[in-house]
Interface confidence: medium
């Protein structure tokens, strides 16, 4: 199916930028892996690069405004021609759910005191309003609560006094015709208009104010301008060459508003002075290599020694990584393919251990299933031997850091019947539903 093709993908917002055009296939659009596409206008934007997870969204608001609730966030698998980690297809949403508490207590209503006395009338003549007030303190509300109803009430009042009426101008009358149809004669042509103080007239008893300003005004007449001439387009110019050497590009034609040129305030030509076309080089763009994550460290060994485990003998270990994805003469990966370090082996070493403090509460699992729970743990943590943190392996090469490597066998006193891990679980409360945010916008 044809798609809308864009030249940029904005990682921070997940939006397509720089529309190249529509009516092209995903395969042609994604000849350039820097490009992105939409299946329909306003739909989900997918980048042409290999799929990976987007950043997590911000946490949604807590599902309740007071006491303990839950909140969701999500991330989306974005990209083309592959899968994200976990064998997940592009477009899939992954969710996380955690407990939240915006406010520990919930609001409690208060009660009103009695009404205070009436204030004076709001006007000194004719009819107005007067107001009285009461306080929300009988009892006072708690935890951001309020009292039901209004803190003040008003009623009509009559001063038994007649108000004066002040004068106001009616609208201006029409301009009188000019005394001549052109400028430059023996008399400067003028036009005049007038207005009346009748909207309303000022009262006599009690006396109102007269209208401010003048009852008439004059101005000079201006001559008629020459007739305007509307602009017209000239022919389209030649098509510009395709500006790219790979993937899709955009060529352009131009025309000028000079057939004729607009004159005396006539309108400019309607429509566009340029038009664009998609050009297809049918050549895939280079794709630079990207390092995979480092592999596991190899076992910690020392040459010519069968085992150095559980001994204060430094060894060496290495790890590697692979340069993936380089295609069509893209750049090779920069940096080293192998990493070497010095190490002490504590693989399967019986070590004294101590219980850790409780971990923080984990995420609610499953985030989109029923009855999610969260957990925290205490772990039996090994106490590492006090071996020297640096060693000098070769004369004149200086001190090198030494890292502990391997899985020891920590020994802790039994805690709640457990020797290695103690876990506590708790249900998550007021759980909201997982809904695709793209669908909610529609």
């Amino acid at each position: 199916d044809p798609v809308l093709c864009f030249t940029q993908y904005e990682e921070s917002s997940g939006k397509c930028k720089g529309l190249l055009g529509g009516g092209v296939s995903v395969e042609d659009c994604c000849l350039n892996t820097a490009f992105a596409y939409q299946k329909r206008s306003g739909g989900l934007c997918q980048p042409c690069r290999s799929p990976r997870w987007s950043l997590w969204s911000t946490w949604a608001p807590c599902s309740v405004t007071c006491s303990e609730g839950s909140q969701l966030r999500y991330r989306r698998c974005v990209g083309w021609n592959g899968q994200c980690s976990g064998k997940v297809a592009p477009g899939t949403l992954e969710w996380q759910l955690q407990a939240c508490e915006d406010q520990q207590c919930c609001p409690e209503m208060g009660g009103w005191s009695g009404w205070g006395p009436w204030e004076p009338c709001s006007v000194t003549c004719s009819k107005g309003t007067r107001t009285r007030r009461r306080a929300c303190n009988h009892p006072a509300p708690k935890c951001g609560g309020h009292c039901p109803g209004q803190a003040q009430e008003s009623e009509a009042c009559d001063t038994q006094q007649v108000c004066p009426t002040h004068g106001a101008w009616a609208t201006w009358g029409p301009w009188t015709p000019c005394s001549a149809s052109c400028h430059g004669g023996p008399h400067e042509p003028k036009e005049t208009r007038s207005r009346k103080c009748s909207a309303p007239e000022p009262s006599q008893k009690p006396p109102g104010k007269p209208c401010p300003g003048l009852a008439y005004e004059q101005r000079r007449c201006t001559g008629l301008p020459p007739c305007p001439v509307a602009g017209g387009w000239g022919p389209w110019g030649p098509v510009s060459p395709c500006p790219v050497t790979c993937g899709l590009g955009q060529t352009m034609e131009q025309r000028t508003c000079n057939h004729p040129v607009p004159q005396h305030g006539g309108p400019f030509c309607a429509g566009d002075a340029t038009r664009t076309h998609i050009c297809n080089t049918a050549v895939p763009c280079p794709v630079d290599g990207e390092w995979d994550s480092w592999g596991e460290w190899s076992p910690c060994i020392r040459r010519n020694m069968k085992s150095i485990s559980c001994q204060e003998i430094p060894g060496q270990q290495s790890r590697g990584r692979t340069c993936r994805g380089r295609k069509f003469d893209g750049h090779r990966c920069a940096g080293q393919q192998q990493d070497i370090r010095h190490c002490y082996s504590i693989q399967h070493c019986p070590l004294k251990g101590s219980w850790s403090e409780w971990s923080t509460w984990g995420l609610c699992m499953p985030p989109c299933g029923p009855n999610p729970t969260r957990a925290r743990q205490r772990l039996c943590t090994p106490l590492l031997p006090k071996y020297p943190p640096t060693v000098s392996m070769v004369e004149g090469q200086g001190e090198k850091n030494v890292t502990f490597w391997g899985r020891p066998l920590p020994r802790c006193e039994e805690l709640q019947g457990q020797k290695l891990v103690v876990e506590e679980k708790r249900p998550c409360l007021h759980v909201p539903a997982c809904k695709d945010p793209e669908e909610e916008e529609l």
Partner: nanobody, 129 residues
């Protein structure tokens, strides 16, 4: 053991309606997302519709949008497919499927048959013109 049993298939005229039912047993039905797929003779299996465990979200293939409706009853351990304005091209073997991941959502997840854990045997629908 786990069982998904479809019912409600048969021979109908073009323009008629039909309602499928899929009865589930042997697993916690209310924790699973459910989907319907179909396979016409000589063609690949095709996604029809899906519904999340809670019933809050539903997803449909473009070819059936507006004509078919998926729903579920967690009390009865059943998922339904209401099919209106049937066409000869709707002729196929219809199967229901169950997914218990509870972790992902979105059309691009539920329209892939390999994400589902359990499948029914299927029921045949023939639409004559």
């Amino acid at each position: 053991q786990v069982q998904l049993v479809e019912s409600g298939g048969g021979l109908v005229q073009a323009g008629d309606s039909l309602r499928f039912s899929c009865a589930a047993s042997g697993f916690t039905f209310s924790s699973y997302a459910m989907g319907w797929f179909r396979q016409a003779p000589g063609k690949e299996r095709e996604f029809v519709a899906a519904i999340t465990w809670s019933g809050v979200s539903t997803y449909y293939a473009d070819s059936i949008a507006g004509r078919f409706t998926i729903s579920r009853d967690n009390a009865k351990n059943r998922v339904y497919l209401q099919m209106n304005s049937l066409k000869p091209e709707d002729t196929a073997d219809y199967s229901c499927a169950a997914d218990g991941s509870g972790r992902y959502s979105g059309m691009e997840y539920y329209n892939r048959d390999w994400v589902y854990d359990y499948w029914g045997q299927g029921t045949q629908v023939t639409v004559s013109s």
